[in-house]
């Protein structure tokens, strides 16, 4: 009898109520492998989820997140709110990055500006909420008498260096 069931292809199930005949999966269900005793219920993409791929008799639906949200977890098991660049998502919703930190994405946390002096360099472009600082030549390279092809560029953005 087990051999009869193993002959049931994906998209069907082995129906014990009908002498182990291979029956098609009912609507809104699927079986992705052969020899299944039951079909699995299709995933529903509702609310913050939207359908990326419709359910078929042989494969589950695949969900994505609606605009303004992004997927988390395996197979987009969760959706999380986007924030603007220069913000991070907290328990109180999207909040601006604190001074000295930045986030250049719509997700994730605010990270500290690079400390240029740790690498012996100077700040070429100041940091903002949305952008990290840009480190330039070391102060020694800019001292009188040092050979430097180009003078240091002035800071082009508002904000301050973390030093």
């Amino acid at each position: 009898l087990q051999d009869l069931c193993s002959n049931c292809p994906a998209g069907t199930f082995c129906d014990n109520n009908r002498s182990q005949i291979c029956s098609p999966c009912p609507p809104n269900s699927f079986s992705s492998a052969g020899g299944q005793r039951t079909c699995d219920i299709c995933r529903q993409c509702k609310g913050v989820f939207k359908t990326r791929k419709e359910c078929s008799s042989t494969s589950n639906a695949e969900c994505d997140c609606i605009s303004g949200y992004h997927c988390l977890g395996a197979e987009c098991s969760m959706c999380e709110q986007d924030c603007k660049q220069g913000q991070e998502l907290t328990k109180k919703g999207c909040k601006d990055c604190c001074f000295g930190t930045f986030n250049d994405q719509k997700r994730g946390i605010c990270r500290p500006w690079t400390n240029c002096s740790l690498d012996g360099k100077s700040v070429l472009v100041n940091g903002t909420k949305e952008r990290d600082v840009v480190c330039g030549p070391s102060p020694a390279d800019l001292s009188p008498g040092a050979s430097s092809a180009t003078p240091p560029a002035p800071a082009r953005e508002p904000g301050h260096s973390p030093q």
Epitope: L72, M78, C79, K91
Partner: nanobody, 123 residues
Framework: EVQLVESGGGLVQPGGSLRLSCAAS????????MTWFRQAPGKGLEWVAH????????YYEDSVEGRFTVSRDNAKNSVYLQMNSLRAEDTAVYYC????????????????WGQGTTVTVSS
């Protein structure tokens, strides 16, 4: 089957109050943060409030702070949104959602949604 069912929406005048309810089933309710979202006509989905598993922490979107109160009754597998001093801009479909495993510790992702209940604030 994991399910969330909202109720309590309706038509209310500006300045009035409504209490929304969300009944949960099919999962261990007391192990999840619960969240309220809303979607105003023609607008995107907006987070409104959420509440920790045991009700000890509650957080609100700035525009509803002081007017809305989220609460839960784990014995009844329900979460509530008490809405006072309602304004025309509160008109929306309100949804409750379940916070996924690890919610607030490592992410703010939600994984289960209700069908929504409509709140209309109009004179």
């Amino acid at each position: 089957e994991v399910q969330l069912v909202e109720s309590g929406g309706g038509l209310v005048q500006p300045g009035g109050s409504l209490r929304l309810s969300c009944a949960a089933s099919g999962f261990t309710f007391s192990s999840h943060w619960m969240t309220w979202f809303r979607q105003a006509p023609g607008k995107g989905l907006e987070w409104v409030a959420h509440i920790k598993e045991d009700g000890s922490e509650k957080y609100y979107e700035d525009s509803v702070e002081g007017r809305f109160t989220v609460s839960r009754d784990n014995a009844k597998n329900s979460v509530y949104l008490q809405m006072n001093s309602l304004r025309a801009e509160d008109t929306a479909v309100y949804y409750c959602a379940r916070g996924g495993d690890g919610y607030s510790d490592s992410h703010f992702g939600v994984d289960v949604w209700g069908q929504g209940t409509t709140v209309t604030v109009s004179s």
